[in-house]
Structure formats: C-alpha cells, structure tokens
C-alpha cells in the first residue's frame, strides 16, 4: 500500500495533509522498507550478503552512486545540485529496478511496488526542482541494450547483480533522504 | 556475538591529537552506520559523527566539525575518529555504536556501544 | 538545527509507580527518535526505536509513543533494576542530538 493510503489515514480525515516535503519522507521510506524485504530474501536464498567477491560484479555495474561533489553530504551540501543528483540518480536506477522484476519469486509484487514508488517520488521530486534543465534523462536504447546485457548473466551474477542493485539503491535513497531532510 | 572494542584513548595536551580506532567482530561490518557517542564526566551523551556504510557520507556535530575526522576501513572491520586541536571540552568517554540495520531495518538507533575509551585533554 | 528538550531532568519516584518522561522536538523528526538506558558506570542500552518499537530483549513494561515534535517513554510498573538515567536521540536531520536526560530515583 502506498503511502498515505493506510487505513490508519482514512480512520483520521482530521489530519493535516501532508506537506511536500513529508510526502517525499514518506514515499522515500516507504521504498526503503519495500527494499529491505526484497534484500530478506535476496539473502536468505544466497549467501550474496556475506560475499567479499562484489568487487568483481560491481565493476560490470554503473549504479549511480552519491559523492561529495554531488553537494548532498553535509560537507559541501547544496540545496539545488543535490536534488539534481537525485533525481538523475533515481532516473538511472529505473532501467535496474525494470531488471529486479523478474527476480523475485515470493516478493515479486513487492519488487513491483519498488518500481511504481520510484516513479511516483521522481514525480514529487520535479516538482520540486527549480533548475528541470540540469537533469539528463537516460538514454532508452542503451537501457535497452544494458538489460539484455544484465539479463543474459550467468546464475550467479545474476544473484550478485539483485543484491548490489538493492544495496545500492538503498544507500542511495538513504543519502537522498538525509539531503532532502536539510532542505 | 556482536563486539565493539574502542581503543586509542588517553591524556593529550590542548591542541594535540589523538586518533581513536574501534574494532568491530560477530557482524558484517560494512552492512552498518557506525557512530561514535562521547559523554563528559557526569554529563549526559553527546553525539559525535556518524560514517554510513558505502556511500562515504559522514556527518559531525557542531562542536568538533572541522577538527574531527570520521573514518572506515570495511576490509579492517574498523572504524576511526581522527582528533585534531584538541580541546580541554574533548575530555570524555568516547563510545563506538552500531547503527540499527544492516538488511533490514531502516530506523536510526544505537543496539550496540563498545566500553568506551577514556579521553583527556588537559596541560 | 533540531533540539530536543527532554523533561524532566530528575524523577524521584517509587517502585511500582508508571512514569512518564517526554522529549519534545523544536521542528518535526516524523518518528525518527530512540530512547536509552544508562545505569551508573555502564555503557547505554537501546530500549525504543522509530518512536515506538520496542528494542529485542528488552521488557515489555518499557513503551514508546509519540510522532512529529511530541515522544513519550513510559514505564509501566518501576523495578529496582529501572533506577538509571534515560536519554532521547533525534535521528532524522543532521546533527543528530540527545535529550539532556532524566534521571529516574527513589523518593
């Protein structure tokens, strides 16, 4: 269920509704515990968490990662490239989360829910954003090609590859939200 | 089992330096936000810094931004504070945490504290 | 920066009693607040996370409420093993800060 579409939020109309910024809290979270069910089982069917040997796939991966320069640390923090940052990031990890869908065998509405959410907050997020023109959108052919690349893996890169999109994608939406709880 | 074992504490002159090191074991170490806590004697506890798993963000409280320096090396299992130009208000009991988490949890809470490391700033 | 105000600073009590303590925000954390324990010449324990999720292993007489500026710990039925100082952690923005603690004593 999404965010805000609980029943403890229809049980109460008097709340307040809900200001931008605690709906993108509120959908960020709601991401991150979709994650954290898809890694449960990610990790209890393959011992990828415990593995010292992502180094070798990650090399094969360009998962969108938050640096310093990207002025959402609390060194350096900037309010308007951070959230460009963002939401770049959130709209190159779309073509990975399109590979998670058919990865799940228990939780596959839950990797659903994952992708849906994420589109959802990128919509929250430009609206929010000032400066659209700074924000490069992926290119669909070489998400295309990646995907077939991605998907004709071996088994155990392919494991490899679901637990370090998941990981990555939960650090980064993690650093997201700690940025965006500054602005 | 879980354990955190902080070590590099002791007396230092204001202005000198001191790098304290905690050493963590019974956990995949990277999977968590770390965080170092100090409480002064007979006050209450005081946040430091915390370093979070892979992204190198790190974060430091007002009173030792700019002279501190958090740190983590995964393949060690070790976490850092570099201590630099210290003060006599540095003197404290510095204790390494674990970071609620790891797969599941996304909350921010201390479920693990080493015994701390003593230390003190005085001429 | 968010402060937290933690009340109150001493709480002479009896065993057996339900205490109460609060910890108010200056801005909104959402429910991104934990309470611990410190008893005399011991390391901190975990007791509360996210507002109100009780910590594995601790008793259920320990209670956490409260969501946005307001957060409520409560006791339910004091034993001697509660006696300590009890502290609350705002997680949600940068810098991260303690309550100034509350320390739970006999009358």
């Known amino acids: 269920v999404p965010p805000g579409e609980d029943s403890k939020d229809v049980a109460a109309p008097h709340r307040q509704p809900l200001t931008s910024s605690e709906r993108i809290d509120k959908q960020i979270r709601y991401i991150l515990d979709g994650i954290s069910a898809l890694r449960k089982e990610t990790c209890n069917k393959s011992n990828m968490c415990e593995s010292s040997k992502e180094a070798l796939a990650e090399n094969n991966l360009n998962l969108p990662k938050m640096a310093e320069k990207d002025g959402c640390f609390q060194s350096g923090f900037n309010e308007e490239t951070c959230l460009v940052k963002i939401i770049t990031g959130l709209l190159e990890f779309e073509v990975y989360l399109e590979y998670l869908q058919n990865r799940f065998e228990s939780s596959e509405e839950q990797a659903r829910a994952v992708q849906m959410s994420t589109k959802v907050l990128i919509q929250f997020l430009q609206k929010k954003a000032k400066n659209l023109d700074a924000i490069t959108t992926p290119d669909p052919t070489t998400n295309a090609s990646l995907l077939t690349k991605l998907q004709a893996q071996n088994q155990w890169l392919q494991d490899m590859t679901t637990h370090l999109i998941l990981r990555s994608f939960k650090e980064f939406l993690q650093s997201s939200l700690r940025a965006l709880r500054q602005m | 089992q879980v354990q955190l074992v902080e070590s590099g504490g002791g007396l230092v002159q204001p202005g000198g330096s001191l790098r304290l090191s905690c050493a963590a074991s019974g956990f995949t170490f990277s999977n968590y936000y770390m965080t170092w806590v100090r409480q002064a004697p007979g006050k209450g506890l005081e946040w430091v810094s915390s370093i979070y798993s892979f992204s190198g963000d790190t974060a430091y409280a007002d009173s030792v931004k700019g002279r501190f320096t958090i740190s983590r090396d995964n393949a060690k299992n070790t976490l850092y504070l570099q201590m630099n130009s210290l003060k006599s208000e540095d003197t404290a009991v510095y204790y390494c945490t674990r970071n609620l988490g790891g797969v599941v949890v996304t909350t921010n809470g201390y479920d693990y504290w080493g015994q701390g490391t003593q230390v003190t700033v005085s001429s | 920066d968010v402060v937290m105000t933690q009340s109150p600073s001493s709480l002479p009590t009896s065993l057996g009693d339900s205490v109460t303590i609060t910890c108010q925000a200056s801005q909104s954390i959402s429910d991104e607040l934990s309470w611990y324990q410190q008893k005399p010449g011991q390391t901190p324990k975990l007791l509360i996370y996210?507002?109100?999720k009780l910590q594995t292993g601790v008793p259920s007489r320990f209670s956490g409420s409260g969501s946005g500026t307001s957060f409520t710990l409560t006791i339910s039925g004091l034993e001697a093993e509660d006696l300590a100082t009890y502290y609350c952690l705002q997680g949600y923005s940068w810098p991260f800060m303690f309550g100034q603690g509350t320390k739970v004593e006999l009358k």
């Open positions: 996210g507002a109100s």
